[in-house]
């Protein structure tokens, strides 16, 4: 098969490889304080960490990328850690007529992989 | 809206920002020479280049990531250039009973964005 087995144990040591991490941010940090009313403090899950060879490969393309990066590191970048899925988040925001709740589907990461 | 307008002009100069680039690779490069018969030389489109602030943001999460990277560069990584879509590729490969053609949907990038 085109898929080599993606690796799930981090060879770089605990917390160094691609994983989900919570970052706290205020509406001011995001530049949203003029239109979002709540939450005023957001728990933002983000994907951080390195992507060593075949670690959490997103797909065949990522595996190829990892291999070619090993052969041509100046030409082909290593895979990088990005969201594989998202968790919907509800924001309360101003509208012309008052206040409204809206769900954002692509705001907070739920899982990560190397792409 | 949660979406700031993603930027499409590269502030770093031509060819420096996230874009699609063709990389030539042999079956030997990929470690596939024992099972893939054709093509023996692959034209692999890959996503390369940097992701400056708001350049080709994949979604709201990527815009947030870009903003927080500006505020906390040691804690939040910059968005990185990854495939937004793929082009199907047909490979001819060995099987127990002979030779077969199979389409791979996630092998070659078709478009790129910053995630």
């Amino acid at each position: 098969s085109a898929h080599a087995h993606p690796r799930d144990s981090c060879p770089l040591g605990p917390g160094r490889c691609c994983h989900l991490e919570t970052v706290q941010a205020t509406l001011e940090d995001l530049g949203w304080s003029d239109w979002v009313l709540s939450p005023r403090q957001l728990q933002l899950s983000m994907c951080v960490g390195e992507c060593p060879h075949l670690y959490r490969s997103a797909n065949t393309h990522a595996q190829i990328k990892a291999r070619l990066h090993g052969l041509q590191p100046d030409k082909v970048p290593a895979p990088c850690c990005v969201p594989s899925s998202y968790t919907p988040v509800v924001l309360m925001h101003r509208t012309d007529s008052g206040v409204s709740l809206q769900t954002y589907d692509d705001l907070v990461a739920r899982g990560c992989h190397c792409a | 809206s949660a979406h700031a307008h993603p930027r499409d002009s590269c502030p770093l100069g031509p060819g420096r920002c996230c874009h699609l680039e063709t990389v030539q690779a042999t079956l030997e490069d990929l470690g596939w020479s024992d099972w893939v018969l054709s093509p023996r030389q692959l034209q692999l489109s890959m996503c390369v280049g940097e992701c400056p602030h708001l350049y080709r943001s994949a979604n709201t999460h990527a815009q947030i990531k870009a903003r927080l990277h500006g505020l906390q560069p040691d804690k939040v990584p910059a968005p990185c250039c990854v495939p937004s879509s793929y082009t199907p590729v047909v490979l001819m490969h060995r099987t127990d009973s002979g030779v077969s053609l199979q389409t791979y949907d996630d092998l070659v990038a078709r478009g790129c964005h910053c995630a």
């Epitope: 919570t22 003029d34 939450p39 | -």
Partner: antibody, heavy 119, light 112 residues
Framework: QVQLVQSGAEVKKPGSSVKVSCKAS????????ISWVRQAPGQGLEWMGG????????SYAQKFQGRVTITADESTSTAYMELSSLRSEDTAVYYC????????????WGRGTLVTVSS | DIVMTQSPLSLPVTPGEPASISCRSS???????????LDWYLQKPGQSPQLLIY???NRASGVPDRFSGSGSGTDFTLKISRVEAEDVGVYYC?????????FGGGTKVEIK
């Protein structure tokens, strides 16, 4: 229709612990925070603390700090409130409520779990 | 902690008549965005509390328009324009400007 379904009534001895569960059914659990509010017999409402299920980050009222632990299991869409070193004054109905962070807007409440502390 | 004080403690009402409940906070609940982080809840007999008003003056989904919230800073009012029999219960204000969230002591509304 989204509901918060709480575990059943408990009778506990002083000094022991109790763990109350709150399961969200029919909605996106991680999109909101879950707070825990208690009400002693004939008394008013008291906020104990809450959690952001998406990150597992909890916040507690100083009064309960060290005695209460709030957790969440995203896989089962369930939040938990554990209260230790129980005393008779902890006899109350414990409610879970869904809100937008700690900015209020508790638009959905569980039916409550009566915890009785008695020797 | 922010102290929330409600008055009156008890409010006997006549159906069809208006009613008003006051809530005072020990600190301002007005945030820099111009909104007051104050909710009103109603707890009907034998039930869980239900959200009536959020951000000081916004009616929650499904709440009849006879309920209205007003006020700013430290002084807030919940008004019922024409009380109905189903409005009986205990009304609570709650501040959400800062943790810990705190509730008023409650106002018991009962039919005369």
């Amino acid at each position: 229709q989204v509901q918060l379904v709480q575990s059943g009534a408990e009778v506990k001895k002083p000094g022991s612990s109790v763990k109350v569960s709150c399961k969200a059914s029919g909605g996106t659990f991680s999109s909101y925070y879950i707070s825990w509010v208690r009400q002693a017999p004939g008394q008013g409402l008291e906020w104990m603390g809450g959690i952001a299920p998406i990150s597992g980050t909890a916040s507690y009222a100083q009064k309960f700090q060290g005695r209460v632990t709030i957790t969440a299991d995203e896989s089962t869409s369930t939040a938990y409130m554990e209260l230790s070193s129980l005393r008779s004054e902890d006899t109350a109905v414990y409610y879970c409520a869904r809100g937008l962070a700690y900015d209020g807007y508790f638009d959905l409440w569980g039916r409550g779990t009566l915890v009785t502390v008695s020797s | 902690d922010i102290v929330m004080t409600q008055s009156p403690l008890s409010l006997p009402v006549t159906p069809g008549e208006p009613a008003s409940i006051s809530c005072r906070s020990s600190q301002s609940l007005l945030y820099s965005n111009g909104y007051n982080y104050l909710d009103w809840y109603l707890q009907k007999p034998g039930q869980s509390p239900q959200l009536l008003i959020y951000l000081g003056s916004n009616r929650a989904s499904g709440v009849p328009d006879r309920f209205s919230g007003s006020g700013s800073g430290t002084d807030f009012t919940l008004k019922i324009s024409r009380v109905e029999a189903e409005d009986v219960g205990v009304y609570y204000c709650m501040q959400a400007i800062g943790v810990p969230l705190t509730f008023g002591g409650g106002t018991k509304v009962e039919i005369k």
